[in-house]
């Protein structure tokens, strides 16, 4: 019995087609992805093949103005239109709190939304009961397939799930649910979830009875053969894991941002054993036409976004200096504002011993592309912020050793004076440079804000200690020559859209007046 699994993950609000790098579409003839194009390909496969499931492995939320404005209603609407069969909860589905998940998505979705390792307690338990499920048995042709969901247990550190949701260990939570499916005579089981490729592989290895793992969170690109675009494969598609009980379990993921549609064909025998598995992600490029009816719907929804872009988010009573003459040479108040917003967006009081789980921010000065003049009545709009942060990136959470941070700050000024983008703006860090010294030895003082303290204060950086840092995804991926970050990071979780982080902060503060205050000397 052959099953076709179509899958997406980490779409992050890319409802419209995008450029090849998943930023805003400029030249339509070379754009990719988007739900209208996705629908064309899905329908084509549904017409050609008998047993098809369309699955999403989480993180539909967060990433463009679509989410900022529609807050998840757009996800429910267009996923319903595409007739998704199931979705797993990702960490970003909790970005607007539990209410921001329940009302727009859980109550509106016409498909099951799954996670076996999230347990509700207290008053929330009855409110959310039945709105998401640990598993769902789906009829597919003459057969049935069990889908069991999972979500990163790091979600409380990455998003805003509140205090009434407990995130359990994935493997511990999945095994009893899979066992339950087996007692219901369901012998074809897909684990669909959002914990990253390493956990996906562990689930394939450790959870008895899971036949296929469809994952997300790590934006992993897998491909067999010559890849069709710029993404470099982390392994073959599907990636085969040998389980502890001796079965070959295919593990798949489909990069991110709706650029690809994962396409996996599985042949099962009567016992539910995977006899064969093969496929590849399908690049959703311009050779695939956008479905006209979905495209028309997108255009209808688009109108509200254009109006939103020019509305006031808040006010500044000072000049927001985002000029390259400042931000690539010294501490600039636009850099301070952005870093403050980045830390504020990551406030998570999950432990009494810590005032927060992260206190530090670094930001490449070259990523700040425009100032904002306060003389326009102080008004700040989304449009203004889009000029400051035009690249559509995210502000991510990483874990780095102190020694890596020291290297990063040396790199920040290794060719100081040439107006290069690697000069770092900071938050929760005091750095002192001596530019008379030779490159690689210019950082003379590096103090960082404590987290395990009730009164935050600055302490000298310890080389062997592991620190959490918020930074742009551009830096996490080694951009501007920060190869040491990419090579030495111990953990990397993708965060919220850069503009959204700053706009939310400005809306929250209402009036802002960031200063240059001696963070960089």
């Amino acid at each position: 019995w052959e099953l076709t699994i179509l899958h997406t993950n980490d779409v992050h609000s890319r409802l419209e087609q995008t450029s090849e790098d998943s930023s805003k579409c400029v030249n339509a003839s070379r754009c990719m992805g988007g739900v209208a194009r996705l629908f064309t390909k899905v329908q084509q496969i549904r017409r050609a093949e008998p047993n098809v499931l369309l699955l999403d492995a989480g993180d539909q939320y967060q990433g463009t103005i679509w989410f900022t404005v529609y807050k998840g209603a757009e996800v429910a609407h267009f996923m319903n239109a595409l007739r998704y069969d199931a979705m797993a909860l990702g960490n970003h589905e909790f970005d607007n709190g539990v209410e921001g998940l329940i009302e727009p998505l859980l109550k509106e979705a016409k498909f099951p939304i799954l996670s076996a390792n999230i347990k509700a307690k207290g008053p929330l338990a009855s409110q959310i009961s039945g709105l998401y499920l640990p598993y769902k048995v789906l009829p597919v042709g003459d057969e049935v397939v069990g889908i069991v969901g999972y979500t990163s247990k790091e979600t409380p550190f990455l998003s805003n799930p509140g205090t009434n949701l407990v995130f359990e260990d994935e493997i511990t939570a999945l095994q009893p649910e899979v066992d339950k499916l087996k007692t219901l005579n369901v012998n074809k089981i897909i684990a669909l979830g959002h914990s990253g490729f390493e956990m996906d592989k562990l689930i394939a290895q450790k959870v008895r009875g899971v036949d296929v793992v469809v994952g997300g969170h790590s934006n992993t690109f897998l491909y067999t053969g010559n890849p069709p675009s710029k993404e470099v494969p982390a392994g073959k598609y599907p990636f085969i894991v040998t389980s502890d009980d001796g079965r070959k379990v295919p593990v798949v993921q489909a990069y991110a941002f709706g650029k690809y549609l994962g396409y996996l064909k599985i042949e099962f025998d009567e016992r539910g054993n995977v006899i064969s598995s093969h496929g590849n992600p399908i690049l959703l490029n311009s050779s695939i036409p956008e479905d006209p009816s979905i495209k028309a719907d997108i255009n209808k929804w688009r109108i509200k976004l254009d109006n939103y872009s020019t509305q006031e988010l808040g006010k500044t009573i000072v000049y927001l200096d985002g000029s390259s003459q400042s931000c690539r040479f010294r501490e600039c108040n636009m850099g301070n504002l952005i870093c403050d917003a980045m830390i504020n967006n990551n406030l998570r009081h999950t432990d009494e011993m810590f005032w927060n789980h992260v206190s530090m921010c670094i930001l490449n000065g070259g990523g700040i592309r425009s100032p904002i003049d306060e003389r326009n009545n102080g008004t700040i709009t989304w449009e203004n912020l889009a000029a400051v942060l035009p690249f559509g990136g995210t502000f991510d959470l990483v874990q780095l050793k102190g020694s890596t941070l020291k290297k990063a700050f040396e790199h920040s000024v290794h060719r100081y004076g040439q107006s290069t983008g690697e000069f770092l703006q900071v938050g929760g860090i005091h750095v002192v440079y001596d530019l008379s010294r030779k490159p690689g030895d210019r950082v003379v003082k590096l103090d960082v804000l404590c987290t395990k303290c009730r009164v935050p204060s600055y302490d000298p950086l310890k080389m062997d200690e592991v620190y959490k840092v918020i930074l742009p995804n551009f830096l996490a991926n080694g951009g501007d020559g920060f190869q040491m970050i990419k090579d030495e990071l111990l953990r990397h979780d993708s965060g919220d859209q850069d503009i959204n982080v700053v706009s939310t902060y400005i809306s929250k503060m209402k009036v802002i007046y960031p200063a240059v205050e001696g963070r960089i000397k």
Partner: antibody, heavy 114, light 107 residues
Framework: EVQLVQSGAEVKKPGASVKVSCKAS????????MNWVRQAPGQGLEWMGR????????FYSQKFKGRVTMTVDKSTSTVYMELSSLRSEDTAVYYC???????WGQGTTVTVSS | DIQMTQSPSSLSASVGDRVTITCRAS??????LNWLQQKPGGALKRLIY???SLDSGVPSRFSGSGSGSDYTLTISSLQPEDFATYYC?????????FGGGTKVEIK
């Protein structure tokens, strides 16, 4: 649990036909196919062909084409294998086996003797 | 048709021995290979499917490996109940074909 139950032993004369049945249970019958395999006394296994339960599509080994007919009765989840123009070298145990031979019938002994 | 050449055709071994049986296909068969066990009474049982996946209930002393046209069944520590005849089966293309079998006997 998958179970395949075959019909009883048969003794046939050369030139006659034999029809062996295989009743399946414990799985969604229409979603799969059935193989027929035979084993002559003291010999190895020989694949004869297969039938898809849902629509009765068949694929026969070239060696048996024209002599073998596989049919299905979806209402009783039963598959049949008929072999005609029997000769002495068709004396064998005939097995039905699921799609990828994960489960086997108990075997049906067919003796061709004058 | 794809020919499956299985070797050895028989072998004598003692309890606890490591036993290796090989099958060579006349062309590349991908991973489309099963290993079957037939006890003296005639009952057939699949041990390994898709080259290396172990059927449920089959002891972990059985393992399969290989790719292209060369495949191996290994019994890491032979047990009394393992004395039987073993067959490989390719299902990469029609007609499916079996190896000639390997009879594992007590030394």
């Amino acid at each position: 649990e998958v179970q395949l139950v075959q019909s009883g032993a048969e003794v046939k004369k050369p030139g006659a036909s034999v029809k062996v049945s295989c009743k399946a249970s414990g799985y969604t019958f229409t979603a799969y196919f059935m193989n027929w395999v035979r084993q002559a006394p003291g010999q190895g296994l020989e694949w004869m062909g297969r039938i898809y339960h849902n629509n009765g599509d068949t694929f026969y080994s070239q060696k048996f084409k024209g002599r073998v007919t596989m049919t299905v009765d979806k209402s009783t989840s039963t598959v049949y294998m008929e072999l005609s123009s029997l000769r002495s070298e068709d004396t064998a145990v005939y097995y039905c086996a699921t799609s990828y031979v994960g489960d086997w019938g108990q075997g049906t002994t067919v003796t061709v003797s004058s | 048709d794809i020919q499956m050449t299985q070797s050895p055709s028989s072998l004598s071994a003692s309890v606890g021995d490591r036993v290796t049986i090989t099958c060579r296909a006349s062309q590349d068969i991908g991973d489309s290979l099963n290993w079957l066990q037939q006890k003296p009474g005639g009952a057939l049982k699949r041990l390994i499917y898709a080259t290396s996946s172990l059927d449920s209930g089959v002891p972990s002393r059985f393992s399969g490996s290989g790719s292209g046209s060369d495949y191996t069944l290994t019994i890491s520590s032979l047990q009394p109940e393992d004395f039987a005849t073993y067959y490989c089966l390719q299902y990469a293309s029609f007609p499916w074909t079996f190896g000639g079998g390997t009879k594992v006997e007590i030394k």
